[in-house]
């Protein structure tokens, strides 16, 4: 509550997160023309990335384009990209939607469709839907430990969200354990009124707000965090503004003296930890 | 404008960026002693990195040191590093400018010069100038979509920079489309009074400031962002303070059971998105 | 000092860091059943990661699990994980502490112990102590250059911590050179009353606070940074809350048609640069 006689100071904050959990992923894998069921285990080194600061990312879904190499190939026949003659293809043209630079030739993409030939990482990425249900949908059961150290330099006061009395096997619950700083990812979504299974397909951004309302006067000292959760990306966003949350990254390797890459389009949840509040003192 | 009767509250912000564009890179490539013209395509997975938070990086130039291996070799003969006898080389010495630890021997670097032998990733990185013009100078035409979600928790008010009415094929323009949140990188530089082609060589840091001056009173409600741009690195910086923006990273691989790496010195533009402002309410 | 007649404005800040230094690492390496002393050099590309924003990370220690592959194997026999019969192992069970999914069988881990068989990255990571002393303990002598650009938009005032008059070969010292922005990592720890050698083993988080108390009135203008240092992680933290600072990452490769990875558990110091302060003007 506002104490007008107090000198208020904004919080200076540092955050450290640690995600735990393993996911079992089952998907169809094609090798040498034969499709069979692939099964793999993903642990933290596979689904998250060494990140600093107030964010962490958990991959919940992906699309792989394996064995790409720099060469010429027909571009992907997305809507409006097909051609019937070379006139439709402009040498040197880079379509922002495409992944390469046109050579000026119209070539067969498959038995029925022709597209402009491009210089690119080939074969070009297929614009296919993210798998549904999400491949790492079991990430709902992962947990994250959030450590938050705060400082009011003007008041020379420092504290943290984890106290020596806390139990390391707790799980946050709004009513039963509101001070526990180990959160089940599925619970975060439930608290925010969102469906994890649904968001996991395309990805999204989830805010974990940590509010410190600190009274630093010795006679009525109080300084503990309050956690709340809200979705930060716009679930009703128009396709043209790239809904969800995804990014592409590549693993490069050499084969027969040719540089190749596997392109991964990773969908997932970026969790932003937003720390705010004030410390007041007479 | 300042309304003194209002209760002001600083903005809580979350940012999500998405870069689009491909670059055609032509450079001299030496293989088996033969130098020929290499041509390659760079897409987002090649020139940017999965990043969280309020920054994104676009690589605009690079210098590669391929096939390095941990062994002994002469250090690079930069100014003041040459020797004529072993006396000039001190066993165990690590020169902060050098990339290895001296063995105490003075050995030939080439036909005319001798330098101290070091234990290092060899051959050591040549201290050559960044290519001019920049290899990915066409990054000027890349675009970035910036999504910004803001929150005034005390006023329980949330909004975002992208409205449902917006057009996903717009491009920001200070006069014609100041609310569009898709920015051409070259335009950002022009607005900041900087030359993209020049900065792309050594790299730099560019600030994209998003200012929210929000009046949350229902009778005169206004809450839209204002974008402005300014260069954050010091273009007049002394050499000793490392002008521009670059970092080194490595790709590791095994060949004939020996661990090798390709060292990449990546120059580029780091874009910092600086969100600030207040929400005022009676 | 507080000038009540002034209009105060919080600082908008951008940070750029550059770490310098090489480390000599000596460790036991086992190849083909034979253990011998390995010696290697780590430079910035090996011990730090391309990072944005207000943090940088320096790896000071590590544990490697080489040649892991997705298959079946006995899980690591940590406390409470041993079994004597299949009854103790539950098919499909994922123990949060374990790194895989149980098949339901109890199998020999070594000549004396049996554990539940799991589908995982195998052989599973051994839960061994971080090496002591830390492998990159010489990181104490690394230096970091910190560039900080600040802005008070309301006062239309911009400045930076590095002035043209500064000397690029300086080293920060609280008394002799308090404006130098090149810091020796060991000095940062000393200033914060911490022991680098000790923290390097398990890792930790160190705060570098940059305080700008700016009087922007022309008649008594003053705007220079003040640096201070404090440890941000809790050194007395209970084991269950993951003391220190570490994360796991993997290097993937293919051998004999099987995807393999080397898992690295990297311990190190995350440095958080916390910039705060106000600009006041009549």
């Amino acid at each position: 509550s506002d104490k007008l006689y107090q000198r208020k100071e904004p919080v200076i904050s540092s955050v450290h997160t640690k995600v735990k959990g393993i996911a079992e992923v089952t998907e169809n894998v094609t090798e040498g023309g034969v499709t069979k069921l692939g099964h793999s285990i993903f642990d933290t080194a596979d689904y998250t990335f060494p990140l600093q600061g107030n964010s962490f990312f958990v991959m919940t879904n992906y699309v792989k384009s394996e064995g790409q190499v720099q060469t010429l190939c027909p571009e992907y026949p997305r809507r409006g990209a097909q051609c019937s003659s070379d006139r439709r293809c402009k040498k040197g043209w880079m379509d922002p939607q495409s992944k390469g630079i046109q050579t000026g030739r119209c070539v067969p993409y498959d038995k029925t469709r022709k597209t402009c030939e491009v210089s690119a990482w080939c074969p070009t990425e297929e614009e296919k839907e993210a798998p549904r249900p999400a491949l790492l949908r079991s990430a709902e059961n992962f947990t994250v430990l959030i450590k938050n150290n705060i400082h009011f330099p003007g008041h020379n006061y420092t504290t943290r969200n984890i106290l020596p009395t806390m139990n390391g096997s707790c799980t946050f619950h709004k009513t039963w354990d509101p001070q526990c700083s180990i959160f089940r990812l599925g619970d975060i979504f439930q608290e925010a009124g969102e469906n994890f299974t649904e968001v996991a397909v395309q990805g999204g951004i989830m805010g974990i707000e940590i509010y410190w309302d600190c009274n630093l006067d010795s006679w009525s000292h109080h300084c503990r965090p309050r956690y709340s959760f809200r979705r930060l990306d716009d679930k009703n966003m128009d396709e043209s503004f790239v809904p969800g949350y995804n990014f592409r990254y590549a693993k490069y390797y050499k084969e027969n003296n040719v540089e190749k890459r596997t392109l991964i389009k990773a969908f997932g949840i970026r969790f932003d930890i937003l720390v705010f509040g004030t410390g007041g003192k007479f | 404008s300042d309304k003194l009767y209002q209760r002001k509250e600083p903005v809580i912000s979350s940012v999500h960026t998405k870069v689009k564009g491909i670059a055609e890179v032509t450079e001299n490539v030496t293989e088996g002693g033969v130098t020929k013209l290499g041509h390659s395509i760079f897409d987002t997975a090649d020139y940017t990195f999965p990043l969280q938070g309020n920054s994104f990086f676009v690589m605009t130039n690079y210098v590669k040191s391929e096939g390095q291996v941990q062994t002994l070799c002469p250090e690079y003969p930069r100014r003041g590093a040459q020797c004529s006898s072993d006396r000039r080389c001190k066993k165990g010495w690590m020169d902060p400018q050098s990339k290895g630890i001296q063995t105490g021997r003075c050995v030939p670097y080439d036909k005319t010069r001798k330098t101290c032998e070091v234990s290092a990733w060899c051959p050591t990185e040549e201290e050559k100038e960044a290519p001019r013009p920049a290899l990915l100078r066409s990054a000027e035409n890349f675009t970035v979509l910036i999504k910004n979600n803001i929150h005034f928790p005390g006023h329980n008010y949330t909004t975002r920079n992208i409205l449902p009415t917006m057009n996903g094929s717009c491009t920001f323009h200070k006069t014609w489309d100041p609310q569009c949140s898709i920015f051409r990188l070259g335009d950002i530089f022009q607005e900041a009074g900087e030359n993209f082609t020049e900065v792309a060589v050594q790299g730099g840091i560019m600030g994209i400031e998003i200012y929210w001056d929000c009046n949350l009173d229902s009778w005169s409600h206004h809450c839209r962002p204002r974008y402005s741009f300014r260069r954050l690195d010091d273009k007049n910086m002394d050499e000793s303070f490392v002008p521009g923006y670059n970092f080194r990273y490595a790709k590791y691989y095994k060949e004939n059971n020996v661990e090798k790496r390709t060292l990449i010195k990546a120059f580029g533009i780091r874009f910092d998105i600086l969100v600030f402002g207040t929400g005022g309410k009676f | 000092s507080d000038k009540l007649y002034q209009r105060k404005e919080p600082v908008i800040s951008s940070v750029h860091t550059k770490v310098k230094g090489i480390a000599e690492v000596t460790e036991n390496v086992t190849e083909g059943g034979v253990t011998k002393l390995g010696h290697s050099i780590f430079d910035t590309a090996d011990y730090t990661f391309p990072l944005q924003g207000n943090s940088f990370f320096v790896m000071t220690n590590y544990v490697k699990s080489e040649g892991q592959v997705q298959t079946l194997c006995p899980e690591y026999p940590r406390r409470g994980a041993q079994c004597s019969s299949d009854r103790r192992c539950k098919k499909g069970w994922m123990d949060p502490q374990s790194k895989g999914i149980q098949t339901g069988r109890c199998v020999p881990y070594d000549k004396t112990r049996k554990t539940c068989e799991v589908s995982a990255w195998c052989p599973t990571e051994e839960e061994k102590e971080a090496p002591r002393p830390a492998l990159l303990r010489s990181a104490e002598n690394f230096t970091v250059l910190i560039k900080n650009n600040i802005h008070f938009p309301g006062h239309n005032y911009t400045t930076r911590n590095i002035l043209p008059t500064m000397n690029g070969s300086c080293t920060f010292h609280k008394t002799w050179d308090p404006q130098c922005s090149i810091f020796r990592l060991g000095d940062i720890f000393q200033e914060a009353g911490e022991n680098f050698t000790e923290v390097a083993v398990q890792g930790g988080i160190m705060g570098i606070e940059i305080y700008w108390d700016c009087n922007l009135d022309s008649w008594s203008h003053h705007c220079r940074p003040r640096y201070s240092f404090r440890r941000l992680d809790d050194k007395n933290m209970d084991e269950s809350f993951v003391p220190g600072y570490n994360f796991r990452y993997a290097k993937y490769y293919k051998e004999n048609n099987v995807e393999k990875r080397t898992l690295i558990k990297a311990f190190g110091i995350r440095f958080d640069i916390l910039v705060f302060g106000t600009g006041g003007k009549f």
């Epitope: 069921l37 099964h39 | - | 592959v69 079946l72 098949t103 099987v258």
Partner: nanobody
């Protein structure tokens, strides 16, 4: 039906060399650890060498340095190269594989055995 089919074996003089191979065939998800065991007349079956899917090898003390186990993950085949053979290496050699028919459904499979005889 999953099968392990061995080949190689036969009669060889002491000091000579011999190679065995064993291929897994049928419908399965994944071949995990593969191994060679042997059983001399009147003795218990003993491990000769095993190799994980990640190519980590383990040898019985009696054959270490003389025998080499390897595998080909494309062909789901395990090999045993035996050099410096001794009369005490005479036995029936059995191929073993831990194979997952489906996810988390591993079973142990054995070959029918192949005879190796070392004459002095």
């Amino acid at each position: 039906e999953v099968q392990l089919v061995e080949s190689g074996g036969g009669l060889v003089q002491a000091g000579g060399s011999l190679g065995l191979s064993c291929a897994a065939s049928g419908n399965f998800f994944r071949v995990n650890t593969m191994a060679w065991y042997r059983q001399a007349p009147g003795k218990q079956r003993e491990l000769v060498a095993d190799i994980t899917r990640g190519d980590r090898t383990n040898y019985a003390d009696t054959v270490n340095g003389r025998f080499t186990i390897s595998r080909d993950n494309v062909r789901n085949t395990v090999y045993l190269q035996m050099n410096g053979l001794k009369p005490e290496d005479t036995a029936a050699y059995y191929c073993y594989a831990r194979i997952e028919l489906g996810v988390l459904e591993p079973r142990d499979y054995w070959g029918q055995g192949t005879q190796v005889t070392v004459s002095s």
